[in-house]
């Protein structure tokens, strides 16, 4: 779809005289009709194949036509047209005397025709005018024109259709070759995918508009690389989604078991030694001279019984010292490796000693694992799920959440691109390894059939008498252009003059 | 035990300003979201606003988007939100959760009520 | 925003009975689906997470069920403690988003 657009610019008649020598009177009113056609070798008679227009008178003998597109459009003259532009035209421009104001073809005597130019070529749609200048014996007309396409409308033809958005269905303008161009932020075949912020992590990130990064559920953080821990997990971190391995001095499913009360609580007083034996438990050290379940208990040295675990005190000028039993060391014989006979393993494990008791290891029942049976195997640790789907822990078993596009128990099959039905017009979708291609239906063409192709009227051959056919591209109908001695709309009557024109 | 004690409610006018804040205890504060969730009076629940753990990443409702800002001090263990220009719809109980907004609320505080009336 | 829809709004029964309350997105929202307990005057209470995991602590009773856009809370024999207001939670969209509660009152 676009517009013919001729710009009359100037005309000359400086005698003031019709075709046929005779003067006007008082002057010739002139005004022009304009018919715009296929190409033609020799322009002839026959249909105004791609419109006509018509001026109201615009001056007297001689006169310059002002540019009056702002004001009611008249100049230049606009001749749309609803098909491919084929390239070429022929152009019929003729200058008549109005004696009166009806201006139509039946008003006026034959004999007002002033004078006649008939052009034909080739001319690419463009932005730029062409100047041309046609000269008779009495006249000069002066005039450019030029082909563009109408709103929306794009390419060497005018036949892409392209109209900007920035909505739900794309965010894009149109480039000069109906190309669409997706508005920053955007990408896709049709710049409906935003562009995440740089850097969100392509599996478990995910946005809506441009240049965010929302975390799907199990992670967090500015590109979502952070996992959250377990919803119950009091004193752990995660390196994936709801584990909760334990800090530091804590055990147990939730890492919520103390095995560190020494460091969190500081029971011991009188800075006495503490030691950890077992879950929220400890033992106090105490210098010598103290003495209390924390230490806070003044005493004299060997009398505090200073030495733990059994450990016998001698009394030394500068204080005291202990011997310790077997397994036990330290200024206090305070210090031991912890053994079976302080319960370590967690969650039903069973503990062995080793070493003559000195160490102990840890067997520990299905699910668990661990040096003190503390942390619950995660089933999704080997990461079963392909293509970035998403392992999820079910009760005795496992899932997987598949990413758009994937599709089976480990997301390991590749969802048709043809599921979705994306060729238009009845076109047949076939799967290729990097997408789909579609097979279009007669008449439709374009990625996904989505352009309609005028049906050729030509082909069956309609015109006779060696006629040149050409399609009417904006009703799927042909025009038969008649060889010099026939006439018809194929050209099958033969004649010996050709007709006037019939407007 | 997981405590969380929310505190810096009360009545103020509309344009006005607000801070509240939650003392965390009895978890890991460093390691995990926090969020705030409001409940206007006899209304349902409301999520706010959320801020990761390590790198303090933040998210909004629209509603409040400009006007609101949380934070959090990991070394005092406390989550903060500033509440600028207070409209009278922010009329509500506002409830300090440990979460994010792609996971559920396993914890929250008892609520501090904030009223914005003239 | 994703809608939850929670029905009924109300609910009486005795205790002993075996009570359900559903909730319905509306889009898909997979499992990502959370049930909450809130008693007068107090702070709602995680119960279930991931459409059927129990929270710590919560009693066996209670359950969920459903995928997609489909939910069910469950309590198979009411106790007089479970009186009280009911609230589902979706959070596999932003913003997350709350049912608006289902009231379970003494018959």
């Known amino acids: 779809s676009g517009v013919f657009q001729l710009q009359l610019q100037e005309f000359i008649n400086e005698r003031g005289v019709l075709a046929s020598g005779r003067p006007c009177e008082p002057g010739c009113r002139t005004f022009f009709r304009v018919c715009l056609k296929h190409f033609q070798a020799v322009v002839s008679p026959g249909p105004c194949t791609f419109g006509t227009v018509s001026t109201p008178v615009l001056g007297t003998n001689s006169f310059a036509v002002r540019d009056d597109s702002s004001g009611g459009g008249r100049n230049p003259l606009q001749l749309p047209f609803n098909f491919t532009w084929p390239g070429t035209f022929s152009l019929i421009i003729e200058a008549w005397h109005a004696p009166g104001d009806d201006l139509r073809p039946e008003a006026l005597p034959p004999d007002a025709l002033i004078s006649k130019i008939a052009i034909q070529g080739s001319l690419a749609v463009g932005q730029n005018w062409l100047l041309d200048e046609q000269t008779s014996t009495l006249t000069r007309l002066r005039y450019s024109y030029r082909v563009i396409c109408s709103d929306n409308y794009y390419g060497d033809n005018c036949s892409r259709l392209c109209k900007k958005r920035n909505d739900h269905f794309g965010h894009y303008v149109c480039q000069p070759d109906g190309n669409l161009s997706c508005l920053p932020g955007w990408t896709g075949e049709y710049c409906q995918q935003p562009i995440c912020l740089s850097g969100c992590h392509e599996q478990n990130g995910y946005c809506s508009k441009p240049a965010e990064c929302l975390c799907r559920p199990g992670w967090q953080g500015r590109l979502c690389n952070e996992c959250i821990p377990h919803n119950g997990c009091r004193h752990g971190t995660c390196s994936t989604p709801w584990q909760c391995t334990c800090d530091e001095g804590w055990g147990g499913l939730f890492c919520d078991q103390d095995l560190n009360y020494c460091t969190h609580h500081s029971p011991c007083k009188n800075g006495a030694t503490c030691s950890n034996s077992g879950q929220r438990s400890y033992t106090c050290t105490c210098r010598p001279g103290y003495t209390g379940v924390d230490c806070e208990l003044e005493l004299s040295e060997c009398d505090s019984n200073p030495c733990r675990n059994g450990g016998s005190c001698k009394d030394q000028e500068d204080g005291y010292h202990c011997l310790c039993p077997p397994g036990y060391y330290g200024l206090h014989c305070e210090h031991s490796t912890l053994s079976c006979a302080d319960s370590p393993c967690f969650n039903g494990g069973s503990c062995r000693e080793r070493n003559q008791g000195a160490n102990y290891a840890c067997e520990c029942p299905p699910n668990f694992t661990g040096s003190n049976c503390e942390k619950k195997v995660d089933r999704c640790t080997s990461n079963p799920c392909a293509n970035g789907g998403q392992c999820l822990n079910r009760g005795p078993s496992r899932m997987c959440r598949c990413r758009p596009g994937f599709t089976g128990t480990y997301c390991e099959l590749h969802v048709s691109d043809c599921a979705r039905n994306p060729c238009a017009h009845g076109g047949t979708c076939h799967d290729l390894e990097n997408g789909l291609m579609c097979t279009c239906p007669a008449g439709f063409s374009g990625r996904r059939c989505e352009v309609r192709t005028s049906i050729d009227a030509c082909a069956s051959s309609p015109c006779f008498n060696r006629a040149t056919c050409y399609t009417d591209l904006s009703t799927d109908t042909f025009v038969c252009n008649c060889p010099y001695g026939f006439v018809g709309s194929r050209c099958e009557f033969p004649v010996g003059l050709p007709p006037s024109f019939p407007w | 035990e997981v405590q969380l004690v929310e505190s810096g409610g009360g009545l103020v006018q509309p344009g006005g300003s607000l801070r509240l804040s939650c003392a965390a205890s009895?978890?890991?504060?460093?390691?995990?979201?926090m969020a705030w969730v409001r409940q206007a009076p006899g209304k349902g629940l409301e999520w706010v606003a959320t801020?990761?753990?390590?790198?303090?990443?933040?998210y909004y409702r629209d509603s409040v988007k400009g006007r609101f800002t949380i934070s959090r001090d990991n070394a005092k263990n406390s989550l903060y939100l500033q509440m600028n220009s207070l409209r009278a719809e922010d009329t509500a109980v506002y409830y300090c959760?440990?979460?994010?907004?792609?996971?559920?609320?396993?914890?929250w505080g008892q609520g501090t009520l904030v009223t914005v009336s003239s | 925003d994703i809608q939850m829809t929670q029905s009924p709004s109300s609910l009486s029964a005795s205790v002993g009975d075996r009570v359900t309350i559903t909730c319905r997105a509306s889009?898909?929202?997979?499992?990502?689906l959370a049930w909450y307990q809130q008693k007068p005057g107090k702070s709602p209470k995680l119960l279930i997470f991931?459409?059927?995991d129990l929270a710590d602590g919560v009693p066996s009773r209670f359950s969920g069920s459903g995928s997609g856009t489909d939910f069910t809370l469950t309590i198979s024999s009411l106790q007089p403690e479970d009186f009280a207001t009911y609230y589902c939670?979706?959070?596999?969209?932003?913003?997350?988003?709350f049912g608006q509660g289902t009231k379970l009152e003494i018959k």
């Open positions: 959760a440990r979460g994010y907004y792609n996971s559920p609320f396993a914890y």
């Open positions: 009895g978890f890991t504060f460093s390691n995990f979201p």
């Open positions: 801020i990761s753990s390590s790198d303090g990443t933040t």
């Open positions: 889009q898909d929202i997979y499992i990502n």
């Open positions: 991931d459409t059927n």
């Open positions: 939670q979706q959070y596999d969209y932003v913003p997350p988003t």
